[in-house]
């Protein structure tokens, strides 16, 4: 799996999970989230050569097409596969509210 | 939806469905498929600015992050959303076989 266990331990130019810390205030301009101040969102990036963690038959076809037609702009892209939620604390007036934001943290990637 | 009805009728630099005809023999080197000789596979391509058909909360966060930090390499990618199968005819010896290959045709796209 193209997850932290594999990607963070290997230098990998191909599609892999990349570390990304996002500070809500600095990076998103969000002032409403009290805690956490930021989180390890991670992201997916890297090349998608033929058979490198292809998600569908179409992405396999597309990566093979791209191998044979390297000048073509059609190629699969490295995107998130498994995502996890993030629990946040914010305030409405002086009342604390806890909410789970779904699909906030990328745990693994795929070529799609 | 970023499908043919929208994308093929508009000049769109942002993430959209793009037409792509794949000839099995010429483009993939596949000689085993008897019919069809090729098919409209289509593909997804284009920029993923903030809120442009974001797939998940993470892709929305990432596109906003990319807006505020344009020099960053972290950004969502335009990939397939809805896919359809393709029915093919091939031979094993002289015996014709009909098979449905799943997820071969892209019908719409998303930023993920």
């Amino acid at each position: 799996a193209l997850d932290a266990a594999y990607c963070f331990r290997n230098v990998q130019d191909n599609c892999c999970l990349r570390p990304l810390y996002i500070d809500f205030k600095r990076d998103l301009g969000w002032k409403w989230i009290h805690e956490p101040k930021g989180y390890n969102a991670n992201f997916c990036a890297g090349a998608c050569p033929y058979l490198w963690s292809s998600d569908t038959q179409h992405s396999r076809v597309l990566s093979l097409y791209n191998t044979i037609n390297p000048e073509a702009s059609a190629s699969p892209c490295c995107v998130s596969q498994d995502l996890e939620p993030l629990t946040i604390l914010y305030y409405i007036g002086k009342t604390p509210k806890i909410e789970q934001l779904s699909n906030m943290i990328v745990k693994s990637c795929k070529c799609s | 939806a970023l499908d043919a009805a929208y994308c093929f009728r508009n000049v769109q630099d942002n993430c959209c469905l793009r037409p792509l005809y794949i000839d099995f023999k010429r483009d993939l080197g596949w000689k085993w498929i008897h019919e069809p000789k090729g098919y409209n596979a289509n593909f997804c391509a284009g920029a993923c600015p903030y809120l442009w058909s974001s797939d998940t909360q993470h892709s929305r966060v990432l596109s906003l992050y990319n807006t505020i930090n344009p020099e960053a390499s972290a950004s969502p990618c335009c990939v397939s959303q809805d896919l359809e199968p393709l029915t093919i005819l091939y031979y094993i010896g002289k015996t014709p076989k009909i098979e449905q290959l799943s997820n071969m045709i892209v019908k719409s796209c998303k930023c993920s």
């Epitope: 810390y21 500070d23 205030k25 600095r26 002032k31 009290h34 805690e35 956490p36 101040k37 930021g38 989180y39 390890n40 629990t87 604390l89 604390p96 | -």
Partner: antibody, heavy 117, light 102 residues
Framework: QVLLVQSGAEVRKPEASVKIFCKAS????????MNWVRQAPAQGFEWMGQ????????NYNGKFKGRLTLTADTSTNTAYMELSSLRSTDMAVYYC??????????WGQGALVTVSS | EIQMTQSPSSLSASPGDRVTITCRAS??????LAWYQQKPGKVPKLLIY???NLADGVPSRFSGSGSGTDFTLTISSLEPEDAATYYC?????????FGGGT
């Protein structure tokens, strides 16, 4: 590398005020929260408050309400902590510490404040 | 405010021993907890952030576990230089209180 350099030791009389500075370098000062923490002699730690230098936003420990003022000068990358109406129980080492990823990852060297009549 | 209770308050162990320190929060703090090491006369050093993540430059014999209200700092094989006071701190709503130290 990240460096937080604090002002030296201070001696103050009861009811006086003390202002400690913390000069930051090696990172984007305006875009990280700065925490202030104190440690009384042979005691544990007490979180006092935090400031976001980029916009001056602050969060204070209610215990110090009205006595604690946190400020930041973005032109010199310096954070300030001022504590007024000092009492003997305020004698402690005062630290500034950068907030990062659910922790304080870099700390200043500490500034000892002695309160004595 | 959230109370952080650390145990034991002190412990004695030998080089090579496996040592466990626990920290309990008075309410759910999810994974918003850090562990620090402080040696006499020195500045605290971050060991673990976000409950389980090892800070840069910290030896792999240190590890953190737990979420919610119960957290553990483990030193898998004690080294003489690990003699110090260890503190936990939560980061789930201000004030960010500390444990009493071990």
């Amino acid at each position: 590398q990240v460096l937080l350099v604090q002002s030296g030791a201070e001696v103050r009389k009861p009811e006086a005020s003390v202002k400690i500075f913390c000069k930051a370098s090696g990172y984007s000062f305006t875009s990280s929260w700065m925490n202030w923490v104190r440690q009384a002699p042979a005691q544990g730690f007490e979180w006092m408050g935090q400031i976001y230098p980029g916009d001056g936003d602050t969060n204070y420990n209610g215990k110090f309400k009205g006595r604690l003022t946190l400020t930041a000068d973005t032109s010199t990358n310096t954070a300030y902590m001022e504590l007024s109406s000092l009492r003997s129980t305020d004698m402690a080492v005062y630290y500034c510490a950068r907030h990062y990823d659910g922790s304080t990852d870099y700390w200043g060297q500490g500034a000892l404040v002695t309160v004595s009549s | 405010e959230i109370q952080m209770t650390q145990s034991p308050s002190s412990l004695s162990a030998s080089p090579g021993d496996r040592v466990t320190i626990t920290c309990r929060a008075s309410e759910n703090i999810y994974s918003n907890l850090a562990w620090y090491q402080q040696k006499p006369g020195k500045v605290p050093k971050l060991l673990i952030y976000a409950a389980t993540n090892l800070a840069d430059g910290v030896p792999s014999r240190f590890s953190g576990s737990g979420s919610g209200t119960d957290f553990t700092l483990t030193i898998s094989s004690l080294e003489p230089e690990d003699a110090a006071t260890y503190y936990c701190q939560h980061f789930w709503g201000t004030p960010y209180t500390f444990g009493g130290g071990t």
